[in-house]
């Protein structure tokens, strides 16, 4: 997911509808004016705000990367929702990119969970039921795998 290209200092002057802040805050879909007197609406498809706020600028909409699909567009009150394409997933510890799901489990393991946009396939040992760490398995150890992928330890 990437931020919009427009740099903060290059943004055009807002021409949006204005209203007054309530106790110094503006509603979702707005930001506060430079003198704090008005609430200015965010620009649809360009920026947004999700909460009551005193932000001087609305938050820039994110754009889905290649390898992602847009589940819902950016509105003035909600950011774009992007999801990894089928066959890929995004881990919590590396959210910046979608990774390819493994095509199979190492020998001696069985698949208990499918590839989803949020997780790789899940493998467990046939006997013990211990989960596999999630690294891509070595070719010689796999039931079904793409060539050249490195081995991984089991937990």
């Amino acid at each position: 997911i990437t931020q919009q290209d427009l740099a903060p200092q290059q943004r055009a002057a807002p021409q949006q509808k204005r209203s007054s802040p309530s106790e110094g805050l503006c509603p979702p879909g707005h930001h506060i004016s430079e003198d704090g007197r008005d609430c200015i609406s965010c620009k649809y498809g360009q920026d947004y705000s999700t909460h009551w706020n005193d932000l001087l600028f609305c938050l820039r909409c994110t754009r889905c990367d290649s390898g992602e699909v847009e589940l819902s567009p950016c509105t003035t009150t909600r950011n774009t929702v992007c999801q990894c394409e089928e066959g890929t997933f995004r881990e919590e510890d590396s959210p910046e990119m979608c990774r390819k799901c493994r095509t199979g489990c190492p020998r001696g393991m069985v698949k208990v969970g499918d590839c989803t946009p949020w997780s790789d396939i899940e493998c467990v040992h046939k006997e013990s039921g211990t989960k596999h760490s999630g690294e891509v398995p070595a070719v010689e150890e796999t039931v079904t795998s793409s060539p050249g992928t490195p081995a991984s330890p089991c937990s």
Epitope: D54, L55, L56, F57, L59, R60
Partner: nanobody, 128 residues
């Protein structure tokens, strides 16, 4: 608690330039998201410019864009505001401020109107 001390104000003719400085102490300067605000006589506080702790995200009020430049020197614990092509309407007390509850989204800093730590201000007067 961070303390801020502005300097560099004074009287200048229209079209002239000034450089304001804000020295910070009592905190790790490189972790502070900061900004400049101003208050003209008989008027309310107005946002001028803001800069993220890294200096990567910079914002300006429409009224000063192209004339003012914000910068920081983390090694010197100092925030700057270079003001050029000054106009009579720029006359105000200029305040350096720290955003102690910064908003970050997608790694980008977004300034607020309600900065919470303030300096004592420095007066800038623009008159012929």
């Amino acid at each position: 608690e961070v303390q801020l001390l502005e300097s560099g104000g004074g009287e200048v003719q229209p079209g002239g330039s000034l450089r304001l400085s804000c020295a910070a102490s009592g905190s790790t300067f490189s972790s502070l998201d900061m900004g400049w605000f101003r208050q003209a006589p008989g008027k309310g506080r107005e946002f001028v410019s803001a800069i993220s702790r890294s200096g990567d995200n910079i914002y300006y009020a429409e009224s000063v864009k192209g004339r003012f430049t914000i910068s920081r020197d983390n090694a010197k614990n100092t925030l700057y505001l270079q003001m050029s092509s000054l106009r009579a309407e720029d006359t105000a007390v200029y305040y350096c401020a720290v955003d102690s509850q910064p908003t970050y989204s997608g790694g980008v800093y977004y300034p607020r109107y309600g900065y919470d730590v303030w300096g004592q201000g420095t007066l800038v007067t623009v008159k012929p």
